[in-house]
């Protein structure tokens, strides 16, 4: 890489006009950052102590009740995905603060901003297993008797994020330094080498298999199990689906910016007025995904809060509520009271 | 009107040092860098560096560790010094500076200074 | 580093012909501002380079609009509608979106 020393705040943000006025000194630009940036900045800030904070608690509340509590394995991956992620945020916030500006080198360039992306395939991927977990729980609560284990579950969380990793990579493989001339300027971004092609198909991809695909599923799963849950007006707690699904809706509500940015710049020939407008959003879109990082143990205490009437007890014991959370299935009135009974010993709540 | 003017020696002993002075007009090195490019029959036109208005300099990671580029703005001097030549140093050195701004490098260029690397 | 691959390397034309030299990068030249910073020059014999169009279409002060320059990501062309006398020389183009600024081999426009 070529050498250039950006302490200088000089060359900032300059923007290239055709307007020529050989009195104005060019190296001398604004210094301040656009409200997009400012906006992300602040997200980012509160994603990262919200995030790194309450997911550290939820791991360590989980941790310990994983070995017997299916519950807690499911909530315990999410938050360790959610944990990875928020360690990105200094560095991109950094280079934020430094207008884009990206002194950590190639490989730092591949894998933290990859992060969010592994991120959203784990997530995704484990949600969609969480309710998968929900959706036998309730239509099959016999083969979850018998089969439904610890076991199964880590290996379920083990295919999860194997997918994960794979879907990662064709960002981390694209993710490129480029070291612009004027002003002096180091970037990390995507670099397809013009193949507009390839950067659909990894769009589209990304769009489909993290967004549509799942949303339209979920949908589905979800309606089927309210479906079920208020037609047998189950009287015991449904503390853990409520949290779920609002996990989930929270999912598709932070990514959509993203998703809808990333295809349209995908479409878009880079310098277009659109592109250019999209591309000045682009923090702001994964910042507002970034709030995924943070959203789930506000979504957590705000369902313990619920459930206890008011917060009485501590925050760990309060999230240990709803996290680990032993349930009752009553789905068939055929069922006998010894076998309720016994399946309350067993299997989760809905 | 601006005009770049070179002075500088024309032949180099290997393993020596080259020093190249470029004095500008019409506009001020406080406000616009200088860039040095080299051409030679074997290489073409090559990049070497660039020292900025505010002083900063960015240099090709090829001639890195030999090159130096600094500048006296009250005199509108900018200086070239590459250490170590070799024979393949051999080449026309030219300053160019920009037209309005470095998005447009390169606009005007020096009159060149013939450089021959040769014991 | 971004190559630039100029073409042809040589170009013989009439007086009043029209020309036209390609030049190809291996990398997009689109800046993370939206411009592309794509420029032509051509040298004469003896002389240093001087600037013809830069931001690939925009022609440099004086330059007659016989000379005109198109293109997007990493093809472009220089073209002289009507070739005359004073354009022959060496024509080069040149990047300076990335570092470091990187130059074609050239392409000389003679008489045929």
């Known amino acids: 890489m070529d050498s250039f020393n950006y302490t200088t705040p000089d060359y900032g943000h300059y923007d290239d006009k055709d307007t020529l006025d050989l009195n104005t000194p060019v190296d001398k630009t604004s210094n301040t950052l656009r409200v997009p940036d400012i906006l992300a900045l602040v997200i980012f800030a509160v994603v990262f102590l919200v995030g790194v904070l309450g997911n550290a608690l939820v791991v360590w509340v989980t941790a310990f009740e994983a070995k017997r509590t299916i519950n807690a394995i499911w909530f315990l991956n999410l938050a360790v995905a959610d944990f990875l992620s928020c360690l990105a945020l200094p560095i991109l916030f950094t280079s934020i603060v430094q207008h884009h500006h990206w002194p950590f080198g190639g490989a730092a360039c591949s894998i933290l901003p990859s992060l969010i992306l592994l991120n959203m395939y784990a997530s995704i991927l484990l949600l969609a297993t969480i309710s998968a977990d929900r959706f036998l729980l309730v239509f099959k609560p016999i083969w979850c008797q018998n089969f439904r284990g610890a076991g199964l579950a880590w290996i379920a969380c083990a295919v999860a994020w194997g997918l994960a990793l794979l879907l990662t990579i064709p960002s981390f493989l694209y993710r490129v330094v480029r070291e612009e001339y004027f002003p002096p300027k180091v970037l990390c971004g995507v670099d397809y080498s013009h193949d507009k092609r390839r950067e659909r198909a990894v769009a589209i991809v990304r769009l489909v298999l993290g967004f549509l695909w799942p949303l339209l599923t979920l949908t589905i799963c979800y309606t089927f199990i309210l479906l079920r849950t208020w037609s047998r007006r189950a009287t015991r707690s449904t503390k853990t689906l409520k949290v779920v699904v609002a996990v989930v809706a929270s999912f598709f509500i932070f990514w959509l910016p993203y998703q809808v940015t990333g295809i349209m710049m995908s479409f878009l020939e880079p310098s277009s007025p659109t592109f250019l407008l999209l591309k000045k959003l682009d923090s702001l879109c994964v910042s507002f995904a970034y709030i995924n990082c943070c959203i789930n143990p506000i979504i957590y205490v705000v369902a313990g809060q619920g459930f206890q009437g008011r917060l009485r007890k501590s925050l760990p014991s309060l999230l240990r509520n709803v996290l680990t959370e032993e349930s009752v299935v009553r789905e068939s009135k055929s069922f006998t009271r010894s076998t309720v009974d016994t399946m309350a010993q067993k299997t989760q709540a809905v | 009107q601006v005009q770049l003017k070179q002075s500088g020696p024309g032949l180099v002993a290997p393993s020596q040092s080259l020093s190249i002075t470029c004095t500008v007009s019409?506009?001020?090195?406080?406000?616009?860098?200088v860039d040095w490019i080299r051409q030679s029959p074997g290489k073409g036109l090559e990049w070497l560096g660039v020292?900025?208005?505010?002083?900063?300099?960015n240099y090709n990671s090829a001639l890195k560790s030999r090159l130096s580029i600094s500048k006296d703005n009250s005199r509108s001097q900018v200086f070239l010094k590459l250490n170590s030549l070799q024979t393949d140093d051999t080449a026309m050195y030219y300053c160019?500076?920009?037209?309005?701004?470095?998005?447009?490098?390169?606009?005007?260029w020096g009159q060149g200074t013939l450089v021959t690397v040769s014991a | 580093d971004v190559v630039m691959t100029q073409t042809p390397l040589s170009l013989p034309v009439s007086l009043g012909d029209q020309a036209s030299i390609s030049c190809r990068s291996s990398?997009?030249?689109?800046?993370?501002?939206?411009?592309?910073?794509l420029h032509w020059y051509l040298q004469k014999p003896g002389q240093s380079p001087k600037l013809l169009i830069y931001?690939?279409?925009n022609r440099f002060s004086g330059l007659p609009d016989r000379f005109s320059g198109s293109g997007s990501g990493t093809d472009f062309t220089l073209k002289i509608s009507r070739v005359e006398a004073e354009d022959l020389g060496v024509y080069f183009c040149s990047q300076s979106t990335l570092v470091p600024p990187t130059f074609g081999g050239g392409t000389k426009l003679e008489i045929k």
């Open positions: 020292i900025w208005g505010v002083g900063g300099t």
């Open positions: 990398q997009s030249l689109v800046h993370s501002n939206g411009n592309t910073y």
């Open positions: 160019a500076s920009p037209y309005y701004s470095h998005y447009v490098p390169f606009a005007y």
């Open positions: 019409g506009f001020s090195l406080t406000s616009y860098g």
């Open positions: 931001k690939v279409s």
